[in-house]
Interface confidence: medium
Amino acid sequence: AGVFELQIHSFGPGPGPGAPRSPCSARLPCRLFFRVCLKPGLSEEAAESPCALGAALSARGPVYTEQPGAPAPDLPLPDGLLQVPFRDAWPGTFSFIIETWREELGDQIGGPAWSLLARVAGRRRLAAGGPWARDIQRAGAWELRFSYRARCEPPAVGTACTRLCRPRSAPSRCGPGLRPCAPLEDECEAPLVCRAGCSPEHGFCEQPGECRCLEGWTGPLCTVPVSTSSCLSPRGPSSATTGCLVPGPGPCDGNPCANGGSCSETPRSFECTCPRGFYGLRCEVSGVTCADGPCFNGGLCVGGADPDSAYICHCPPGFQGSNCEKRVDRCSLQPCRNGGLCLDLGHALRCRCRAGFAGPRCEHDLDDCAGRACANGGTCVEGGGAHRCSCALGFGGRDCRERADPCAARPCAHGGRCYAHFSGLVCACAPGYMGARCEF
């Protein structure tokens, strides 16, 4: 038994051109978390079910809001290690998948939304008990830097965590070819391999190849419970008449293992052996494939023929997210030009244009003066989505159809008298004043 530990050092834009935009924005702050999935490094033909060695989910990282104009930095990460406990021997060769997820913290209906930002995978050789191994993986334009190691949980030691070390009361010296288990413990054991199939719960061995049973168990592999006197079952309360143990409900009664899993009892509970493609305590979990219809809102599923391979959803216009589960607010991109009003009708986008503009996106500036005549010698002036007439002297109004009284505004200064004339107006100035408007 032992623990696989993963330390994420940084996640951010990789080197080179095409650096990604920050996954968070001022409008939509977000935070990251990571998921690791481990599989024993078997050949493809004998591929195990997903995450057969185990999986772990990190805590959420700090909330991050993009600073407009600033380059996308390495994003703030969750604290602590991702730890994947393993119960059996460490396989030495393993495959990993590390997923970077984004949790958006905007005002979504139904709480925060999650989407997969990046997924990296690889196969590595690693001995338990060794130093931290460093790695850099790229997924598209993103770069993930991390370290990992496998360590044994006491009393297990060794490169596969299969040797058991117990401290000795009396000091002893190790024989040739044998080393002490650990600096503080003075037992020198060779790798101990019990008889194949020996029950890990009810059997143990002190010599390679043997299988000795714990109290209450028997059989060559310690899988048979010992019966009391002539009674058939070791379980349940004692019968007053016979003194025998009456069969009680066992943890495997009714088979708690789903999806064709087989149940075997353990001292405290039960254990399910799951068929290929299923995992979990009761074999109640399986990977997602395109056959499960994971792409919503008419998205097209590609790849993912079996649970070990990833699928990708190609979303129809108006939807996004790893499963096309999120509707895009297409009006937020401000597609309507020249002040047009955007309407997202679901199946299509419409722009309601201001006067003087037309086109699907209000991109055409209409000729405001087309078909518009100004009367009485006025000239049409275009602009602002509406036409305007510059009228000849003596005329006014929108189309220069109204006869204007040039004296109505009292244009003659210093008490001068105004007279309307066919060519405009004439000011008769009071004594001592002169000029076209008696202004001098």
Epitope: R35, W114, E284, V288, F296
Partner: nanobody
Framework: QVQLKESGGGSIQAGGSLRLSCAAS????????MGWYRQAPGKGRELVSR???????YYADSVKGRFTVSQDNAKNTVSLQMNSLKPEDTAMYYC???????????WGQGTQVTVSS
């Protein structure tokens, strides 16, 4: 921890109706889509129906017009109303939650439906 438990299966004559129910705990309905699968003896598991967040529904061609899936978020249940049942509908029916945050399917234990002619 997601847990799914089916009920409502049983034996019935062809042409009859059954309503399967799935009690779902630990399921976030805006992050998971609920479905029903079935597995006939000696055959693979097939998707019968799915209800997506927002209420969109999917039905296999073989059950369209006869089966209806519904979801009661307040009671944490998903139901499959099966009408005009046929002998070929005989199978073990499984409740399913496809949760895309974890990118996994969760399964119930199954409930047996037997339709005799």
């Amino acid at each position: 921890q997601v847990q799914l438990k089916e009920s409502g299966g049983g034996s019935i004559q062809a042409g009859g109706s059954l309503r399967l129910s799935c009690a779902a705990s630990g399921v976030s309905y805006n992050r998971c889509s609920m479905g029903w699968y079935r597995q006939a003896p000696g055959k693979g598991r097939e998707l019968v129906s799915r209800i997506q967040p927002g209420g969109n529904t999917y039905y296999a061609d073989s059950v369209k017009g006869r089966f209806t899936v519904s979801q009661d978020n307040a009671k944490n249940t998903v139901s499959l109303q099966m009408n005009s049942l046929k002998p070929e509908d005989t199978a073990m029916y499984y409740c399913n939650a496809l949760c895309w945050r974890e990118n996994v399917n969760y399964w119930g234990q199954g409930t047996q439906v037997t339709v005799s002619s």
